[in-house]
Interface confidence: low
């Protein structure tokens, strides 16, 4: 067991052209928060697949209001770390998704509105207990800088948090056959309960007698490196029967090199051999230029003539990510207006519009009244993809073609008699009432009162009209 910790350093416009507009305004102040999702293995799964290693949500950041005319700065961030506890062994290889969310604080009906501002994803190798690794990721014109690490929760120790340590029973030495538990020199390794011979570096167990393998190792005792020739399906930490990495024991166990860097052991540490375009202790700093062709799926590379000036990939429709490497679920952006149904066909987006609407995004409200006349002097009223007629007095029905009985609704109050008339209706009021609908009682002194009593009160009951 242990905790994955993520520290967001900054979120703001990336270097280079095309600076994004501030997500907040004086009219619509907002604040940021972050979500991290972790999955075991080097999976290329969709953003929506389960966060099998865990997920966490940050606190809300400070409220931010854009200064008119100012470029979008680095935005104020929430305090503290994002912490994702993991119950089992740390897999050594993992995929992450970090989402930046905006909470709009304007006059929203029904509370604040949330919208996804940016999403970055990556695949990394990381040993538990190591130092903070640093990373820079870009999403469109935005740039996110962050650090992360995995640490074990006592009594677990080791690069996978699978070895257990216990306080010494005697002050001077550990029990028979048990080693001191580096780096906790005052503790001893707990007795092993895994299957006999199970590799202490590459295997672990949660039940006595079992031997489950870490990513990259296989065999009954987890002593066989996985073949490097077969990159098959993404795996969880305990199903490493096929795959494509061979982390060795020691410092490279759970390769700490980012961005596809390869790890090689040194006598007391490790070194990362970085792919072209990356550098830094863990290949975490990007020096890629457009000359390296970093944009996938037909993305257009802009800027970045030298390693100090970053490039930006302008992605074609349907792709996103720092390098246009991720297919977008374009329907998640709800592009179809007025309740239209969204269909992502891969090569194009289609909206199936509700009746009364048209256009590529169902943005056009059809003229419902076009070619639809209302009879007998009625007027056509548009609305909701259908038309209706507001009929002249004495007529009703969908097109005002039906002659209406104006007295059908019993419009005369207090027992007044209704008479249909060419101009509408006439009420003959009962004694003591007056008005076009017999709605006002007549006082003995001849003055009329305020409107008639509400239902349930008789005219003689004591009442006050406010």
């Amino acid at each position: 067991a242990g905790v994955f910790e993520l520290q967001i350093h900054s979120f703001g416009p990336g270097p280079g052209p095309g600076a994004p507009r501030s997500p907040c305004s004086a009219r619509l102040p907002c604040r940021l928060f972050f979500r991290v999702c972790l999955k075991p293995g080097l999976s290329e799964e969709a953003a929506e697949s389960p966060c099998a290693l865990g997920a966490a949500l940050s606190a809300r950041g400070p409220v931010y209001t854009e200064q008119p005319g100012a470029p979008a700065p680095d935005l104020p961030l929430p305090d503290g770390l994002l912490q994702v506890p993991f119950r089992d062994a740390w897999p050594g290889t993992f995929s992450f998704i970090i989402e930046t969310w905006r909470e709009e604080l304007g006059d929203q009906i029904g509370g604040p509105a949330w919208s996804l501002l940016a999403r970055v994803a990556g695949r990394r190798r990381l040993a538990a207990g190591g130092p903070w690794a640093r990373d820079i990721q870009r999403a469109g014109a935005w740039e996110l800088r962050f650090s992360y690490r995995a640490r074990c929760e006592p009594p677990a120790v080791g690069t996978a948090c699978t070895r257990l340590c216990r306080p010494r029973s005697a002050p001077s030495r550990c029990g028979p056959g048990l080693r001191p538990c580096a780096p906790l020199e005052d503790e001893c390794e707990a007795p092993l309960v895994c299957r006999a011979g199970c590799s202490p570096e590459h295997g672990f167990c949660e039940q006595p007698g079992e031997c489950r393998c870490l990513e990259g190792w296989t065999g009954p005792l987890c002593t066989v490196p996985v073949s490097t020739s077969s990159c098959l399906s993404p795996r969880g930490p305990s199903s490493a029967t096929t795959g494509c990495l061979v982390p060795g024991p020691g410092p490279c166990d759970g390769n700490p090199c980012a961005n596809g860097g390869s790890c090689s052991e040194t006598p007391r540490s490790f070194e990362c051999t970085c792919p072209r375009g990356f550098y830094g202790l863990r290949c975490e700093v990007s020096g890629v230029t457009c000359a390296d062709g970093p944009c996938f799926n037909g993305g257009l590379c802009v800027g970045g003539a030298d390693p100090d000036s970053a490039y930006i990939c302008h992605c074609p429709p349907g792709f996103q990510g720092s390098n246009c490497e991720k297919r977008v679920d374009r329907c998640s952006l709800q592009p179809c207006r007025n309740g239209g149904l969204c269909l992502d066909l891969g090569h194009a987006l289609r909206c199936r519009c509700r009746a009364g609407f048209a256009g590529p995004r169902c943005e056009h409200d059809l003229d419902d009244c076009a070619g639809r006349a209302c009879a007998n002097g009625g007027t056509c009223v548009e609305g909701g993809g259908a038309h209706r007629c507001s009929c002249a007095l004495g007529f009703g029905g969908r097109d005002c073609r039906e002659r209406a009985d104006p007295c059908a609704a019993r419009p005369c109050a207090h027992g007044g008699r209704c008479y249909a008339h060419f101009s509408g209706l006439v009420c003959a009021c009962a004694p003591g009432y007056m008005g076009a609908r017999c709605e006002f009682p007549v006082h003995p002194d001849g003055a009329s009162a305020l409107p008639a009593a509400p239902p349930g009160l008789r005219p003689g009951d004591p009442q006050r009209y406010l």
């Epitope: 910790e5 520290q7 350093h9 900054s10 640093r134 800088r145 650090s147 540490s269 070194e271 830094g280």
Partner: antibody
Framework: QVQLVQSGAEVKKPGASVKVSCKAS????????ITWVRQAPGQGLEWMGD?????????NYNEKFKSRVTMTRDTSTSTVYMELSSLRSEDTAVYYC??????????????WGQGTLVTVSS | EIVLTQSPATLSLSPGERATLSCRAS??????LHWYQQKPGQAPRLLIK???QSISGIPARFSGSGSGTDFTLTISSLEPEDFAVYYC?????????FGGGTKLEIK
Amino acid sequence: QVQLVQSGAEVKKPGASVKVSCKASGYTFISYWITWVRQAPGQGLEWMGDIYPGSGSTTNYNEKFKSRVTMTRDTSTSTVYMELSSLRSEDTAVYYCARETTVGGAYAMDYWGQGTLVTVSS
Amino acid sequence: EIVLTQSPATLSLSPGERATLSCRASQSINNNLHWYQQKPGQAPRLLIKYVSQSISGIPARFSGSGSGTDFTLTISSLEPEDFAVYYCQQTQSWPLTFGGGTKLEIK
């Protein structure tokens, strides 16, 4: 302009602790890592560790000092502290704080404090 | 840990001459190497980062080259203010380490 101003010289006895401060100004304090490097008289430079001021728990230490060094920060005063305990005579050195070159990123150090001389003597 | 060996330990040259300082790593450090200048009583100053990337405010006469394990700092034409101690630093693996320094003195 970016400035790192360190506390004054200290004289300590063996076994004691020293706490050196480094006050930052001229940039967004919480966004850049601060590194501590020491230099014994007439000797070269030695990396001790670093801290990310945006989060006090985000630190990396050189294994050589791990059991004796603690780096902390106070965001209200934009100050980073380095405390070294169980001092020995060989800890006599000038202690420098330095800012790393990019937000959250690289490890090269572009701005340095003026240094704090710590003398350990009985 | 990675050991950086600088040579020569002392280099005696005159103003106007070309200086070539060497830094050798005990194992490959890719391009994760930086150069600093230190004058007596002062803090170090970053001259070059990542082997050859220039730093704002540093004169163009300072340049860096190399890869893997062998690196060079070149000062094309020495000025009086260039006489100082020069250190290389690696950021390839923990702990970060510095070379022992090359003292550049006036001949």
